[in-house]
């Protein structure tokens, strides 16, 4: 079936090796010759020619294909010129001949036993495979093609991606490095607890791929979608040469959704216990799972063992707020935390949602800060608050919000990083509500916002200014 892969080979006598320990040669004849007409003879330098046993297969509308599989592994030698020629037994003619090096005619069998599963991040796909000839896998490079699987359209998209797979593992990376510090002190980084804007995927699904002999990681896919994928391999062109082998049979995989869609938020108050919460879905039950990993890299032949996240009572503090499911587990500060939420709908369908991985020090939630105020002069307020965490004062940022009584909209102010207070000028003879919240956003610790402090009611009298 792989003959088409050798189409670019202009030699009438085409040869290929699957493992570089075998050799198959074939050629086609239009002429209707008797069986036994041809002999395929071969010889290495200074050796006596030998005949390779031929089989033939009739090809409709064309003629006959003659095929020889070298019978003995010892007859297949690398780095020596092999002289081949086809002799006609009945007529005095050498039908065709060529000289080749077995090490330059590789046509590897496709990788087999492909396993595919969601990676550690939403939109990631972890795949691993077995090489039919492991002894040559170091001398092969791989190519992957994949695309979204549309059950309504079995042919899939017209554009499929072909991605050369040179190396495995993106550079060992901490999930979500605190690049947010480059912006304003309290700018929102993309965090596992952050319900940020959905990224729209371009039609050509731009994605990154990295690979190793037996595993690779694709990122940039659409969480919650189904994908098909295929692999093929080719000699690396350095130690061994040849052509791309055929594609493996397609494998399909359903990627978990992005837990952002469930409003997943995880935090720790004590750097030991982690609590995760997400919106409870209507007519569905849900369960949280977690696992710890040491390093974020392609886990070769290693699939995570998800542990149960211990369920807490469901909370529903107000009618407007959606009901939350919560769970908690003990964590460690030396490993990355991965969260998975499984939602089971009434008919029993299970949907998985993956959170973005994080270190425990990236999910530290501060206690609600206390806000104190006093009026210095008419309408001129002096504000003061205690740092909820004296050990991270320089990494704590605050938001102060206030609104006039009877108003719906809040005005939000961000004091400088590490500030312990400030002044506020308000309109005369007016009533206000003030609230404060805090979060960690430094090089050592980060985390979600604390809850807003209880509203502080103030009556004042002048215009607003810091």
């Amino acid at each position: 079936q792989d003959v088409s892969l050798l189409a670019s080979d202009s030699e009438p006598l085409k040869c290929f090796s699957r493992t570089f320990e075998d050799l198959t040669c074939f050629w086609d004849e239009e002429e209707a010759a008797p069986s036994g007409t041809y002999q395929l003879l071969y010889a290495y330098p200074r050796e006596k020619p030998r005949a390779c046993p031929l089989s033939s297969q009739s090809m409709p509308h064309f003629g006959t294909r003659y095929v020889c599989q070298f019978p003995d592994q010892e007859e297949v030698r690398l780095f020596f010129p092999l002289h081949l020629w086809v002799k006609n037994v009945f007529l005095n003619q050498t039908r065709t001949q060529r000289v080749l090096f077995v090490d330059s005619v590789g046509l590897p069998a496709p990788p087999s036993i492909i396993k595919a599963m969601g990676g550690s991040q939403p939109g990631e796909l972890q795949i691993s495979w077995e090489e039919p000839a492991p002894e040559i896998s170091d001398f092969l490079r791989y190519e992957l093609r994949y695309g979204p699987r549309d059950p309504k359209n079995s042919t899939g998209p017209t554009v499929i991606q072909l991605i050369a797979t040179e190396t495995c593992c993106p550079a060992l990376q901490r999930p979500h490095s605190a690049s947010a510090l480059d912006q304003s002190p309290c700018a929102q980084p993309t965090m596992p607890w952050q319900d940020g804007p959905k990224q729209t995927s371009p039609s050509r699904e731009a994605s990154a791929l990295t690979a190793e002999g037996g595993s690779c990681l694709i990122s940039g896919l659409q969480p919650g979608n189904s994908y098909w994928l295929q692999l093929r391999s080719e000699p690396d062109g350095i130690s061994l040469g040849g052509s791309w082998g055929s594609w493996s049979l397609p494998v399909t995989v359903d990627l978990p959704g992005d837990a952002v869609a469930l409003g997943l938020q995880c935090f720790t108050l004590d750097l030991k216990n982690v609590t995760c919460q997400w919106q409870q879905q209507d007519h569905a039950s849900s369960q949280g799972f977690f696992y710890h990993s040491r390093a974020r890299c392609c886990p070769r032949d290693r699939y995570p063992i998800w542990e149960n996240c211990e369920e807490e009572e469901k909370t529903n503090p107000g009618l407007q707020t959606p009901q939350f499911s919560r769970c908690h587990f003990k964590s460690r500060n030396d490993s990355i935390i991965h969260i998975l939420v499984e939602v089971t709908t009434a008919p029993g369908t299970v949907h998985s949602y993956l959170g973005s991985p994080f270190w425990i020090h990236q999910a530290v939630r501060l206690p609600t800060p206390n806000l104190h105020w006093r009026e210095i002069s008419s309408g001129h307020l002096e504000l003061e608050w205690q740092h909820p965490s004296s050990w991270a004062a320089q990494e704590t940022c605050y938001q102060l919000r206030y609104t006039g009584e009877g108003h719906q909209d809040w005005k939000v102010l961000e004091p400088p990083l590490g500030a312990r207070g400030g002044t506020l000028e308000l309109r005369p003879r007016s009533r206000y509500r003030l609230q404060l919240r805090a979060r960690l956003n430094g090089p050592t610790y980060q985390g979600p916002w604390s809850s807003w402090s209880d509203p502080t009611r103030v009556e004042t009298a002048t215009e607003t200014a810091w």
């Epitope: 002429e31 209707a32 008797p34 069986s35 007409t37 009739s58 009945f90 007529l91 005095n92 003619q93």
Partner: antibody, heavy 118, light 107 residues
């Protein structure tokens, strides 16, 4: 033009050997092609007996149970059929023929009739 | 060995008739089939190779067809000189074998 001519005894006694010669003119039998012996029994049934190729390799019809051999004399541009231990069943007209480019018998001799009888 | 069967051993035909002679192999011979014509007192003469290829000098009223195990020789308009016995021969597998022959006679 290529011509083939069979020659040999018209009568052979049972259990003896039958020897026939095919003389080829107009083409060297060592240059190319494959040179065949075919016989036709009195009921008109045709039987392929064997060949010798331009290079001297031979092949025979297994039905003759190793009784026949085909050889050649390249200096005379002739090839031969020897059939041992003949019986009356071997009475036939013997033809020599060339296997041509299309692997079919494109040139035939006119045939020589052989009777096996005591 | 591959058996070649020509179902009719003889035909009585009229000049100008269309004649069809059939030949069946005991197994697939992949169009390795030749047709020969033999007139009384003469050696066989090659008409067709590879089931359908007409030899040089053979009149175009002769044609061959078929594949697999079943083959046919057709003569569109029978002439006097076409009288004789027709043989099929397979050359796919050794030993090469001939059909029993089909004799054409004029009514």
């Amino acid at each position: 033009d290529v011509q083939l001519q069979e020659s040999g005894p018209g009568l052979v006694k049972p259990s003896q050997s039958l020897s026939l010669t095919c003389t080829v003119t107009g083409y060297s039998i060592t240059s190319d092609y494959t040179w065949n012996w075919i016989r036709q029994f009195p009921g008109n049934k045709l039987e392929w007996m064997g060949y010798i190729t331009y290079s001297g390799s031979t092949s025979y019809n297994p039905s003759l149970k190793s009784r026949n051999s085909i050889t050649r004399d390249t200096s005379k541009n002739q090839f031969f059929l020897q059939l041992n231990s003949v019986t009356t069943e071997d009475t036939a007209t013997y033809y020599c023929a060339r296997l041509g480019r299309r692997y079919t018998m494109d040139y035939w001799g006119q045939g020589t009739s052989v009777t096996v009888s005591s | 060995d591959i058996q070649m069967t020509q179902s009719s051993s003889s035909f009585s035909v009229s000049l100008g008739d269309r004649v069809t002679i059939t030949c069946m192999a005991s197994e697939d011979i992949y169009i390795r089939l030749a047709w020969y014509q033999q007139k009384p007192g003469n050696a066989p003469r090659l008409l067709i190779s590879a089931a359908t290829s007409l030899e040089t000098g053979v009149p175009s009223r002769f044609s061959g067809s078929g594949s697999g195990k079943d083959y046919t020789l057709s003569i569109t308009s029978l002439q006097t000189e076409d009288v004789g016995t027709y043989y099929c021969q397979q050359y796919w597998s050794s030993p090469w074998t001939f059909g029993g022959g089909t004799k054409l006679e004029i009514n």
